[in-house]
């Protein structure tokens, strides 16, 4: 017998969670990230929308722009110049695809206290920045590039053949932007502004994605989007510099491709900027297991960029994919030619290389069955970086520092023991020569920002400590979690359960698995998140679970590449195995299990609840990749190589969602999506509802108008009812 | 509330030089970026210079090999050394912080350059 808790007064004024909490974003956290301008020195967006300077060495901070000069242009971001004396405010912000937005510019004279008049920016841009050093201004208008000596002046325009859907200068095409860099911008400043790099994308010859936008008008515009699909045509992008003193001079130099890359489709996947005369291009063949490093340097004689072979760096997996989700970039050291880089080592784990001469000189610096994950700053003396190392947990991220100035080198975890219950999952922002840094925390507790000393890592202040969030939850009940791991035939699953409150061993209850498991992803984090999952474990009683199986990132290769050229199988075997551990544990009410996933997780969603195996009772799928030959190239290619009979055409049939329509039958099915999804889309579930209505299959749908892959507004709040009262009526829950 | 107090303007031949002075009082000094700044008649204020707490310098284009900024954290002091002087070179100086707080300015220190 356990004693009652009827009479406990502060367990009465406990409540669980609503779903009107959950899509109010009233259990919402805040975190803090400086915009660093100097190493002691950042700016930050006051509550009542000032733009203060702070000083972390005075203590001191001062107003360098009112809030009332930002809501005399409506601006809701801006940008100071490295000289100081300018800012841009941007206003009209209109999204555009994932990174992508157009915005109107202002240019704000600090030392006088008014806008720049004359020679004022064309609108809407699509991309603005600032020189590193003093004010030029390089953007981009209608897909040309142009520069501006001075705010003030009139511009200078580098390039004339930009043309929508069709050839783009400095900023990415649709899937350069979604898959490859993945950024807005497509051009670099070289480190004291003398050069600017940019990339030109050709779509001529990509197939075009159309579908309807219905907004008010009497007949539907139709959004084209230039979108390379699996084998299709792809992009053909080159690299140009320009010398930003003299830009009429020569005009733009391309540099030269590697010629083991141009021998057939290639991409472009990053640039990195080492000198103002050194410059390091990365390039990966269309096929993505080979990438090479190139750096290339300026010839003042010829005012060329001479790459030469010997400094080309061959980066090449042979069990799968070049690289985790991306390649890594590389993070150049002090003499400008050598470099550290996050890389398979010999027993298939990603860890910190040094590379001074050839890769396969390349020293390692970390290594351990765990991996490193960023590397955020080199100094002259110091590494600091990211990883999953202690304690064994993947899902967690701590920041070490590395002594790189010593031999042997000393590493020294500065996050591990700093608030060990409620901090394990960190990232970090530096200041210039990693003076200050800032340290922000995401869980598994309430997160918290803060500021520390660069040199003796000692805390100096609280940036955000969500208060605010601290005392509302105060009367909350609050699911449980748990984060363990299931070792099954040599393959370790790591999951996370989330419990009602009161939960009970000894009872049965509703198990909901929730899924992304594409590849190089991870859903089990020790991050804090108050989200509908919450809700549904705090107030409907539910289990959920999410697990990470194969193909899934930062347990070393074995695990990730396991699904190379073979999507949706082991994913949704790992899955099912899980359900049934979790069935095993003795508390799951088995004839009540469910399934859901977004996206890549709506495919895997799908696919588990058309296995055969009767475990699922229902599921839902949003916005699913129902067929690989349907989503774009640079992903899909790199997991599963080309949709072609000579390589892997077969299993891009045979994992399609419709091959499946016939096993829907015995399971109750949700399909939702968006019908001006970009991304994955709407033809991925019409392709879906057309198999099922064929098979004769009963199902239910939802369309959202006009909405994109991220179901956002007004579309968010029906979306989590709708699938609310589906789970509810599939788990017997009264309303 | 601070205090900037710029000194040693004048009237100097072209070719000729000068040495500008800023002392600040009422905060701390030596961690903050400082800059110099000029306004020629009927027109806007532009930056000149500035030097970081690191004492890593910026130049205008206009004044980059003639001037150099210098800082001494130990009398709360700014200094602008202006060599080769233009009669472009006329305006009143002004020292900040940079960037400058909103709306405040010292009174400045007239350098006039003849010809």
């Known amino acids: 017998l356990r004693p009652s808790r009827v009479h406990n007064s502060e367990e009465n004024t406990m409540r669980a969670l609503t779903l009107k909490d959950i899509l109010n974003g009233t259990f919402s956290y805040k975190t803090f990230f400086p915009n660093w301008i100097s190493g002691q020195e950042y700016l930050h967006q006051s509550a009542d929308n000032n733009i203060v300077l702070y000083n972390i060495e005075t203590g001191q901070s001062y107003t360098i722009l009112s809030n009332r000069t930002m809501k005399s242009v409506n601006a809701s971001n801006y940008g100071l110049s490295p000289d100081r004396q300018f800012v841009y405010l941007e206003s009209d912000y209109s999204k555009l695809w994932r990174y992508s937005y157009t915005a109107t510019y202002y240019i704000y004279d600090l030392s006088n206290g008014e806008f720049v008049r004359g020679n004022e920016l064309p609108r809407p841009i699509q991309y603005l920045c600032w020189s590193p050093v003093g004010s030029k201004l390089a953007y981009v208008y209608q897909n040309n590039i142009y520069l501006k000596q001075r705010p003030g002046d009139p511009p200078f325009q580098i390039t004339f053949n930009g043309r929508e859907n069709k050839i783009f200068n400095g900023i990415p095409d649709w899937v350069y932007e979604e898959e490859m860099l993945p950024t807005k911008y497509a051009l670099w400043w070289s480190p004291n502004g003398k050069f600017l790099a940019y990339a030109e994308f050709n779509d001529k010859d990509i197939p075009v994605i159309a579908y309807s936008y219905y907004g008010d008008e009497q007949y539907p515009r139709t959004i084209n989007i230039p979108y390379p699909k699996a084998g299709a045509k792809n992009p053909v992008v080159r690299i140009f510099i320009i010398d930003t003193t003299y830009p009429a001079y020569v005009g733009p130099q391309e540099v030269p491709v590697p010629a083991m890359i141009a021998s057939s489709d290639y991409y472009f996947s990053w640039l990195t900027w080492v000198t103002d005369e050194r410059v390091c291009l990365q390039w990966l063949k269309r096929v993505q297991n080979v990438s090479v490093l190139s750096i290339c340097d300026f010839r003042e004689d010829w005012q060329t960029w001479d790459c030469p072979k010997t400094q080309e760096h061959i980066e090449e997996s042979r069990t799968g994919w070049a690289g985790g989700f991306f390649v890594s970039r590389p993070v150049f050291s002090y003499d400008a030619i050598s470099y550290y880089k996050i890389f398979s080592d010999k027993d298939g784990y990603k860890h910190i290389h040094y590379i001074k001469d050839t890769v396969e000189n390349a020293i390692q610096i970390t290594s351990g069955k765990w991996e490193a994950i960023n590397i955020f700053r080199v100094t002259q003396d110091s590494l600091f970086y990211s990883s999953n190392e202690f304690e064994e947990y993947p899902g967690r991220r701590n920041i070490y520092r590395i002594s790189i100035g010593s031999y042997p080198p000393s590493k020294k975890c500065v996050t591990c023991h700093l608030r060990k219950e409620r901090c394990q999952y960190y990232t970090a922002s530096f200041s210039d020569y990693a003076k200050y840094y800032a340290l922000v925390c995401y869980g598994p507790g309430i997160p918290i920002s803060t500021l520390h000393d660069g040199r003796t890592d000692q805390e100096i202040k609280i940036l955000e400590e969500n208060k605010e969030l601290e005392n509302a939850l105060k009367n909350i009940q609050l699911p449980k979690e748990e984060i363990k791991k299931l070792e099954v035939d040599e393959i370790t699953l790591w999951y996370k359960m989330i419990l009602p409150p009161q939960f009970d061993r000894s009872k049965k209850y509703p198990l909901l698995i929730q899924v992304y498991g594409g590849p190089c992803s991870q859903s089990v984090r020790s991050v804090f998140a108050v989200n509908w999952i919450s809700y549904l474990a705090s107030k409907e009683g539910m289990v959920i679970a999410l697990v990470d199986g194969r193909g899934t990132a930062f347990q070393g290769d074995k695990l990730l590449y396991a699904v190379y050229r073979k999507l949706g199988v082991y994913e949704v075997e790992d899955q099912i195995t899980a359900v049934r551990k979790f069935i095993e544990m003795g508390f799951i009410d088995e004839k009540r299990i469910a399934i859901w996933g977004w996206s890549y997780g709506g495919y895997v969603s799908s696919l588990a609840l058309a296995s055969g195996t009767g475990l699922f009772k229902c599921g839902i799928a949003v916005a699913p990749v129902s067929s690989w030959e349907y989503y774009a190239s640079v992903y899909t290619e790199r997991f599963m190589g080309l949709p072609t009979k000579d390589d892997n055409l077969e299993h891009y049939k045979n994992s399609t969602v419709m091959a499946r329509a016939e096993y829907f039958r015995n399971v109750d099915y949700l399909l939702i999506h968006g019908t001006a999804d970009d991304n994955v889309h709407f033809q991925n579930s019409a392709q879906i509802a057309k198999a099922l209505v064929n098979a004769q299959v009963d199902f239910q749908a939802m369309w959202y108008s006009d909405q994109n892959h991220g179901l956002s507004g007004l579309s968010t709040n029906h979306l989590y009812t709708h699938m609310t009262h589906f789970l509810k009526q599939c788990f017997s829950l009264s309303d | 509330q601070v205090q900037l107090q710029e000194s040693g303007g004048g009237l100097v031949q072209a070719g000729g030089s000068l040495r500008l002075s800023c002392a600040v009082s009422?905060?701390?000094?030596?961690?903050?970026?400082m800059g110099w700044y000029r306004q020629a008649p009927g027109k806007r204020r532009e930056l000149v210079a500035t030097?970081?707490?690191?004492?890593?310098?910026n130049y205008a284009d206009s004044v980059k090999g003639r001037f150099t900024i210098s800082r001494d954290d130990g009398k709360n002091t700014v200094y602008l050394q202006m060599n080769s002087l233009k009669p472009d070179d006329t305006a009143v100086y002004y020292c900040?912080?940079?960037?400058?707080?909103?709306?405040?300015w010292g009174q400045g220190t007239q350098v006039t350059v003849s010809s």
């Open positions: 900040n912080f940079a960037p400058p707080p909103e709306g405040y």
């Open positions: 030097i970081l707490s690191s004492g890593s310098t």
């Open positions: 009422g905060r701390l000094f030596s961690a903050n970026t």
